[in-house]
Structures are given as structure tokens and as C-alpha cells.
Interface confidence: low
């Protein structure tokens, strides 16, 4: 099948980094300087991404496959393959149309990027607050009051915190 | 400063063809996406489309898709948008608009955008 179709088709035998060039008899012609390709059988070659502006490249063109960029310092990619540098805030910030603003009480976050996510409620899992949060860091739960009494055997390790993103119900 | 200058709207009957053109002129024009939009009385701003900033790559809003084509020249610094088949609905005020180096929000959403043309209207 495949020595079948190459007989009709001869731009079938071009491989990944040419093109199969109709005004020259459908030769395999390579691509041009800042151009890919990156399967075979391709009838043009697309044009390279350049990272340019808030962009940086993280892996440069080559004849086979794409640019990929990556943003510079200050900024973090958003959207599929880096579409998108979105600006940094501090931690205890988040980015808001007006630039970055702290988190409001009784909220934090601790990454420079995302939102600001409300502080777990220890006492949704009958804990008692071990450590106060901030705006960068979420609350330490810490062991319930009654786990603290004299005749209590154990201590009760503090609950792990909170995925990411998970606020409490 | 950063200007963008539309001209070519008008009165076009349906079925009809019209060709926008954007200027630009104090920025790198070719580092930028750019994107067109458009507003009918009483809605919200509607993305229209988007063209990379070397022309490499585009998105449009299934509405216009097939009928709009979207180019840039970026030796002229101008962003055109050819209006193919036109209906009664693509009646509004059509803008052109620079992408930001960064946003929050999606490639067709109105805030992804810095610097707005003074718009055309097109009936």
C-alpha cells in the first residue's frame, strides 16, 4: 500500500523538514530559514514561532519542529504551549486588571502566581487553629482542644493542609 | 505615542464585500498580535478574530468564520480585515486592537487587548 501510494502521490516520500515543492515537479525541497515541518508529506512548511517582547525562547526552530518560548523574568506562561506571559505578583498578592493586590484578610496565597484562596476552616474538621495564617501562608491546624486534655494518650498530628485550589466547603 | 488609525467602512448591501484597514505607528507593530472586534447597538464588544504576530497563526469567531479574512503587512505597519459575504447582522462599529505582552484572560476577551482603533462603522 504505502509503494502504491507513493506512485500517485510523490509528495508522500517528503519527510518531516522538507516540503513537497509544486513549482519544482513536487521535488522534497527543504524548508526555508525560520520555516518547519514536522511530518512528512507536507505541501508547505509553517512559518517558526519567534519569541519575542515578554517571550524568551526556551527551545529554538529547527527544520522539524517548532520554537518553544517560555516568558522572561517578572512573568509566567499561561494558555497551551506558552500562548500567554501573565506578570508575577508577590507572594500575598494576586493579579487583578489594576496590577497586583493583596490578598484580602482571611486569604492567601503563596505563589507568585494564581489567586488569593480563603484560609482552611480548622474547625470544619474539629481543630483548633495552631498557627495563625497570613496573606502568604494558609492557617496550621493544630490538634482539637479535647486531644489536648491531661488524660489524652496522643496527640493528634496536625492535618496535612489543603490541595491547592480546594477551599473549604 | 501608540495609534491606531482605521479607515474603509461604509454602506455595503448584504452579501456585499468591504476591506478594513488598521494603521499603527509608534510601536514595533510586528512584535504585537492584533485582533479585530466589533460592537452592535445595545451588546457587548464581540471578538471577531486574531493574527499572530508574524501572520503565522489565527483564530476566529465561528460567526465570521469562512467569510472574514484577517492579513497584515508588517513593512506598512497596517492590519487589514476582508469582509466577505456580508450579512445584515454584521452591522456594528468594527475596531482593531493590539494584543498586551501579557493577560489574564483569553485570546478573544476585550481586557487581552491595550490599544483600540477609533473604530469604523460598517452597515
Known amino acids: 500500500f504505502e509503494r502504491t501510494r507513493s506512485l500517485q502521490d510523490p509528495c508522500s516520500n517528503c519527510p518531516a523538514g522538507t516540503f513537497c515543492d509544486n513549482n519544482r515537479n513536487q521535488i522534497c525541497s527543504p524548508c526555508p530559514p525560520n520555516s518547519f515541518s514536522s511530518a512528512g508529506g507536507q505541501r508547505t512548511c509553517d512559518i517558526c514561532r519567534q519569541c519575542k517582547g515578554v517571550f524568551r525562547t526556551r527551545k529554538e526552530c529547527s527544520s522539524t519542529s517548532n520554537a518553544e518560548c517560555d516568558c522572561t523574568p517578572g512573568f509566567h506562561c499561561l494558555g497551551a504551549g506558552c500562548s500567554m506571559c501573565e506578570q508575577d505578583c508577590k507572594q500575598g498578592q494576586e493579579l487583578t486588571k489594576k496590577g497586583c493586590k493583596d490578598c484580602c484578610f482571611g486569604t492567601f496565597n503563596d505563589q507568585k502566581r494564581g489567586i488569593c484562596r480563603p484560609w482552611t476552616n480548622c474547625s470544619l474538621d474539629g481543630k483548633s487553629v495552631l498557627v495563625n495564617g497570613t496573606k502568604e501562608r494558609d492557617v496550621v491546624c493544630g490538634p482539637s482542644p479535647a486531644d489536648l486534655s491531661p488524660g489524652a494518650s496522643s496527640v493528634t498530628p496536625p492535618a496535612p493542609a489543603r490541595e491547592p485550589g480546594h477551599s473549604p466547603q | 505615542q501608540v495609534q491606531l488609525v482605521q479607515s474603509g467602512g461604509g454602506l455595503v448591501q448584504p452579501g456585499g464585500s468591504l476591506r478594513l484597514s488598521c494603521a499603527a505607528s509608534?510601536?514595533?507593530?510586528?512584535?504585537?498580535?492584533m485582533a479585530w472586534f466589533r460592537q452592535a447597538p445595545g451588546k457587548e464588544r464581540e471578538f471577531i478574530g486574531r493574527?499572530?504576530?508574524?501572520?503565522?497563526?489565527?483564530d476566529y469567531a465561528d460567526s465570521v468564520k469562512g467569510r472574514f479574512t484577517i492579513s497584515r503587512d508588517n513593512p506598512k505597519n497596517t492590519l487589514y480585515l476582508q469582509m466577505n459575504s456580508l450579512k445584515p447582522e454584521d452591522t456594528a462599529v468594527y475596531y482593531c486592537?493590539?494584543?498586551?505582552?501579557?493577560?489574564?484572560?483569553?485570546?478573544?476577551?476585550?481586557?487581552?487587548?491595550?490599544?483600540w482603533g477609533q473604530g469604523t462603522q460598517v452597515t
Open positions: 509608534g510601536w514595533a507593530f510586528d512584535n504585537y498580535g
Open positions: 486592537a493590539r494584543q498586551r505582552s501579557y493577560s489574564r484572560y483569553g485570546i478573544r476577551a476585550p481586557q487581552t487587548y491595550d490599544y
Open positions: 493574527l499572530a504576530w508574524n501572520g503565522g497563526s489565527t
